[in-house]
Interface confidence: low
């Protein structure tokens, strides 16, 4: 039988009546164009709904943009279009929502061609009121808030000017011209690249990287011959053109660009690219594209300095055309990432790592599933996950994989079971242990979301026909109940729930079509009466993460420590609540050689955990040796893996070697590090 249809499935009593009393319909009589929805603040219940238009467009056909506001999680909406003076709001800028709970919103309007500058509407009270402000420039990008101070905004103009506001967009100042890319760093620092000659495109590879730490009063050039730059965790990366040829290399800084080190990564040619897949304060996952239009590359993981890299995964799928990669951070369990590889026969397979890129394996076959036609052996196959690449290829995959930090261990994804990803209609699978084991959760493609920190999972079937049924589970997807939320089916367009998976409200968006008209409609369902009581201590059980054998002393040790979590029992139907905090208890593990990576100039021979000195340095290792900083070339061969907390056990101390004797030189010379003031 299908999952969840078993006789003994724990049913929630009287759920139809409880949900019917908590289902709120809102019909939008005059919504046209494309609808975008944004949550304003955290736990405020404030939602903004905006209809926007692509420019240019025959605007008169549609009438103006409409803006609606809800302050009860979408149960009721009020038309507040008059607050933005019935202006057109541009799709590509959408709604710029301020960080944290600042309550700030910026809407960028479309103005007529002859005007001096653009126009924005600003709110700092969770969209209760808006102030119209005319800009002294035409914006090229959405307004960017400083993560540290939501009053500080930056934007690029269509003339490549870098504009800054210190009073939440009231007054603007152009702090630099000829700017290609600008990003906020930490402590209100702005990093940006500039061109000297023709344009951003013409000067690619000859750009300069600048920094201002005082919002444009003074500047420092921190890099030259720059192709591009990026920020990840505490790392600042720049791809820098080589002196000799058209290749470029990654350089990294951990002090906001004051000093740089060459990363021990392969250089790339003109048609290749680097991509930061994920970064935190400990380390970075870097994708390095293969030469040629292969559609794949190599994932490298860094040390704690972002300098020395270990090869993590070969043939990593990352298309050059659409820029699609399936790389996914499983946020519900530390150390877990999922991605796709392109195998030699051009089939796509899913790989998973449980130790932050140390080892990758195939996903275990779900016990309740058969191997499909892609499997050579009908008894041995794996689960393959559909993610961004499948969605870009217009496969019948409505959603990417889903996990939430506060729904510990839960991962939901579309997939197929075989030797590779199948183009057949996928099913939905769930893991409750962070990706170690999987179960088929729902037949066919669905939209899904997690509510109440995992206490409820909601799903809607992906169909071209109108729908009126929602499914929900209170036991992590084992058993499902169906609820008919309206008599009149709607063409479904999306599920909306407050980010963070703490809410118990879900909004179903869609439209109804009659002979002459179509109307947008939303249904908001509050599940609070399904989970009638608050969870108590007895509702939780201890779960050992990453643990397959609790009897093993070292089992569950990931990055030098293991964790036990308190998790809701599947049989408990109760509210975790909005204030739920994940309870975890770490315990430190003894160190082994697996807790260390090989430092520069060392490698691990096959099937050996010891780091051995490379007899000779070749390729990019030799380049790093020639251009790397002196202090990074003095090593005992081992470095602790970033974020590894092991104690005691093995301490691989040995003679410190100076690899500088094998080579010498350095990177960004001091004469290139000039300062100037505005």
């Amino acid at each position: 039988s299908a999952p969840g249809e078993d006789e003994e499935c724990g049913r929630v009593r009287d759920f139809v009546a409880k949900l019917a009393n908590n289902t709120h319909q809102h019909v939008f009589d005059d919504l046209r164009g494309s609808v975008s929805l944004s949550w304003v603040g955290d736990s405020t219940g404030v939602i903004l709904v905006l209809t926007t238009f692509h420019v240019p467009l025959v605007i008169m056909t549609f009438g103006q943009s409409k803006l609606y506001r809800s302050e009860d999680y979408g149960k009721n909406f009020k038309d507040i279009t008059d607050l933005i003076n019935n202006t057109f709001i541009r799709t590509e800028f959408g709604m710029a929502i301020g960080p944290e709970n600042s309550g700030k919103v910026v809407l960028t309007a479309e103005v007529s061609g002859g005007s001096r500058g653009g126009r924005i509407f600003r709110s700092s009270d969770f969209a209760k009121n808006f102030v119209q402000t005319d800009l002294p420039f035409h914006p090229l990008t959405q307004m960017m808030y400083s993560p540290q101070n939501s009053d500080y905004l930056l934007a690029l103009s269509t003339e490549n000017g870098l504009w800054v506001s210190k009073n939440f967009g009231g007054k603007w100042e152009e702090i630099h011209k000829a700017v290609c890319l600008a990003k906020w760093g930490s402590d209100n620092t702005i990093f940006f690249t500039t061109y000297a000659n023709g344009s951003c495109k013409a000067d690619l590879g000859a750009l300069e990287l600048w920094r201002t730490s005082d919002l444009g009063k003074s500047f420092k050039t921190i890099g030259v011959k720059i192709y591009s730059f990026g920020l990840g965790g505490r790392f600042l990366f720049a791809s820098v053109m080589a002196d000799k040829d058209t290749t470029r290399r990654i350089h990294v800084s951990t002090d906001q660009g004051d000093t740089w080190s060459m990363a021990q990564l392969p250089s790339v040619g003109q048609e290749q690219f680097y991509s930061i897949l994920a970064a935190n304060d400990d380390m970075v996952f870097m994708h390095v594209d293969e030469p040629g239009d292969t559609g794949f590359g190599t994932i490298f993981t860094s040390d704690d300095r972002g300098i020395v890299y270990s090869k993590s995964l070969d043939r990593h799928l990352y298309t050059t055309t659409g820029g699609e990669t399936d790389f996914t951070n499983v946020t519900s369990l530390r150390g877990v990432y999922i991605t796709s590889v392109l195998s030699e026969d051009n089939s796509i397979q899913t790989m998973i790592t449980f130790d932050q890129g140390g080892r990758w394996t195939h996903l275990r076959k779900p016990e309740n599933s058969e191997c499909d036609a892609t499997a050579k052996n009908k008894n041995e196959c794996s689960l393959h996950i559909h993610a961004s690449y499948s969605i870009s290829q217009k496969l019948n995959v409505p959603m990417a994989p889903l996990s939430e930090p506060n729904a510990v261990g839960i991962v939901i994804a579309h997939g197929s079971v075989g030797d590779a990803i199948s183009v057949m209609v996928p099913d939905v699978y769930i893991s409750d242990d962070g990706g170690y084991s999987w179960t088929k959760m729902l037949e066919g493609p669905h939209y899904y979301t997690i509510l109440d920190s995992g206490g409820i999972i909601v799903a809607i079937e992906h169909s071209s026909r109108p729908i009126n049924v929602i499914k929900f589970s209170t036991d992590e997807g084992q058993c499902w109940q169906t609820y008919t939320f309206t008599r009149d089916p709607i063409y479904f367009t999306g599920l909306a729930s407050e980010p963070g998976a703490r809410s118990m409200n879900i909004s179903i968006w869609g439209f109804t079509e009659s002979f002459l008209t179509s109307q947008w409609v939303s249904y908001t369902i509050d599940f609070k009466d399904i989970l009638e009581r608050n969870c108590e201590e007895k509702d939780y059980t201890i779960w050992a993460a990453h643990s397959t054998d609790p009897e093993d002393y070292e089992d569950g040790c990931i990055l030098g420590y293991k964790e036990q979590f308190l998790r809701l029992r599947k049989s408990s139907v109760c509210q975790n609540g909005r204030d739920y905090v994940v309870t975890k208890q770490p315990s430190i593990c003894l160190c082994s050689l697996e807790d260390f990576l090989c430092d520069f100039g060392y490698y691990r021979p096959e099937n050996d955990s010891k780091c051995v000195e490379q007899p000779e340095l070749k390729g990019h290792d030799l380049e790093f040796c020639l251009y790397g900083r002196e202090e990074h070339l003095t090593t005992n061969g081992y470095r602790k893996i970033p974020g590894d907390k092991c104690q005691g056990g093995v301490n691989p101390v040995r003679e410190v070697k100076d690899l500088k004797k094998k080579c010498t030189s350095n990177f960004l010379s001091p004469e290139k590090q000039n300062s100037k003031s505005n």
């Epitope: 093993d552 002393y553 104690q647 005691g648």
Partner: antibody, heavy 124, light 107 residues
Amino acid sequence: QVQLVQSGAEVKKPGASVKVSCKASGYTFVAYYMHWVRQAPGQGLEWMGWINPNSGATRYAQKFQGRVTMTRDTSISTAYMELSRLRSDDTAVYYCARGKRSSGWYEGYGMDVWGQGTTVTVSS
Amino acid sequence: DIQMTQSPSSLSASVGDRVTITCRASQSISSYLNWYQQKPGKAPKLLIYAASSLQSGVPSRFSGSGSGTDFTLTISSLQPEDFATYYCQQSDVSPITFGGGTKVEIK
């Protein structure tokens, strides 16, 4: 109850090898590390290394590297310590000791259960 | 290797006395320190783990304190069965190392 029972006393000549056994009972053998510690007459305690009975993984003190081999037989819940190329200063009482289980917060890996000790005398 | 220095190497005390033994590590070992008691001809017995946690079955007159490099074992009221040799042991860094021992004798 939880106990570790070691093999009997041994007298060996210099250059020979000795293999001491340690039979565990009263607990799940594979769930706890087994340490080996020795004590020369009138001297203090000296750690030799440990074995993870579950995986067979070992850690040896540098001083004994190349001379000591720790093994286990999970079917009979027994750990073994073999010391080769014996010298007269290897004369000591050899103890096996169970590593205290780290459940929950890190507990410093003390040794909470000890064998009765095996006296090894190396004499020509 | 981390050196563990115990002091005093021996002491004489009477029943009912408060006895303090110190252990110093040559570098910081956080709180990864254990204390053992050993009587002549017997195997050592774990008293305190993680610097201050009392091993189950050990009388509460034994207590441990300290972190970093300096640690203390205290016997609040010495009993006849407490006359023995006491060892500290660090488990922060491999190899595990023991202190030289402190012999507590009857005055």
